[in-house]
């Protein structure tokens, strides 16, 4: 018998390589049973996670799962960074992995952090 | 008002283990990563560990030094970090900190603290 | 693993004098460093990060620079509570390193 507790499916340190100026949906693959969970993003800045309140989200429903849709109308060179959606159900939080975006500002190309550096900081992102 | 508590210290046997706990309050502990820094007497401070938060899955990482022998973990809803140490030796003997750290950006700039308590003794000895 | 080399170990200091205190990392640790004060007896305390940003509550005499593999940390005019052992420490790349420290004591 499957499982009826809400699942995220953001794959353990998944990430996306997008252009400043473009249009973005950023996908929460979300797995429920009978009722549809509330479900928010925040974007990671240092060690915090901050709420996304005020920003275009939508859902798409599809046979066997769900997505949250956090939308970049176009996208931002701010918007780089690494992002999670959570899920709020009977009481529970479930927290997905984070999934980072990598804007490339074809404006001003600046170089990417190195993993080393990424690791040991990985609040690097946030410049 | 911030408090970090660490205990589990004492006296422990040569190829004995311990585990140290850190139990805080005061500040909104599933923001912060922990580390773990020890000061063997009358020497410097030496890094022992670090654990993430939830945000960072929680990852773990660890002095070369001591990889094998240490093994650190988090309770979130109990607002408390743990590290046990295995097969002990004499070196190991020094006072082990508990330190809390976070950081933000807010307007391009990083807003870092950090907290210590005052640390528990370990002393490895037949 | 990245060194970190204090100097001098041990500063004979006087009140009022003006103090500077180096720090050396075997590698381009970029501007990941901070500078902790431990006075006899008690735990560390955060005095700069990130090479120059003072932590909140800590006397504007104390600053920091520096860039890449050289760092120095200047009390402008040393008070008798200044007397301390301060430490850096790179949180570059791992594993995290702290130099041996100098410590400052009055003639």
């Known amino acids: 018998k499957e499982s009826c507790d809400v699942q995220l499916y953001i794959k353990r340190q998944s990430e996306h390589s997008i252009l400043a100026g473009d249009p973005f949906e950023l996908e929460c693959p979300v797995k429920y049973c009978a009722n549809r969970p509330h479900v928010t993003w925040c974007k990671l800045n240092g060690t915090t996670c901050v709420k996304l309140e005020d920003r275009q989200t939508s859902w798409k429903e599809e046979k066997n799962i769900s997505f949250f849709i956090l939308h970049f109308e176009p996208v931002l060179p701010n918007d780089n960074g690494s992002y999670r959606c959570s899920a709020n159900f009977q009481s529970n939080l479930i927290e997905s992995h984070s999934t980072t975006l990598y804007v490339t500002d074809v404006k001003s190309a600046s170089e990417r952090p190195s993993k080393d550096e990424m690791a040991s900081r990985p609040w690097l992102l946030y410049r | 008002e911030v408090q970090i508590l660490e205990t589990g210290g004492g006296l422990v046997k040569p190829g004995g283990s311990l585990r140290l706990s850190c139990a805080t309050s005061?500040?909104?502990?599933?923001?912060?990563?922990v580390n773990w820094v020890r000061q063997a007497p009358g020497k410097g401070l030496q890094w022992v560990a670090q654990?993430?938060?939830?945000?960072?899955?929680?990852?773990?990482y660890y002095a070369e030094s001591l990889e094998g022998r240490v093994t650190i973990s988090r309770d979130d809803s109990k607002s408390s970090v743990y590290l046990q140490v295995s097969s002990v030796r004499a070196e190991d003997t020094a006072i082990y900190y508990c330190?809390?750290?976070?950081?933000?950006?807010?307007?391009?700039?990083?807003?870092?603290?950090?907290?210590w308590g005052q640390g528990v003794m370990v002393t490895v000895s037949s | 693993d990245i060194q970190m080399t204090q100097s001098p170990s041990v500063l004979s200091v006087s009140v009022g004098d003006r103090v500077t205190l180096n720090c050396k990392a075997s590698?381009?640790?970029?501007?990941?460093l901070n500078w902790y004060q431990q006075k006899l007896g008690e735990a560390p305390k955060l005095l700069i990060y990130?090479?120059?940003n003072l932590q909140t509550g800590i006397p504007s005499r104390f600053s920091g620079s520096g860039s890449g593999t050289d760092f120095t940390v200047t009390i402008s005019s040393l008070q008798p509570e200044d007397v301390a052992t301060y430490f850096c420490?790179?949180?570059?790349?791992?594993?995290?390193?702290f130099g041996a420290g100098t410590k400052l004591e009055l003639k």
């Open positions: 330190s809390p750290i976070s950081s933000y950006y807010h307007d391009g700039s990083l807003h870092y603290s950090d907290y």
């Open positions: 005061g500040f909104n502990f599933n923001d912060y990563f």
């Open positions: 654990i993430r938060n939830k945000n960072y899955n929680p990852a773990t």
């Open positions: 590698h381009n640790i970029k501007n990941y």
């Open positions: 990130d090479t120059v």
């Open positions: 420490f790179q949180y570059h790349s791992w594993p995290y390193t």
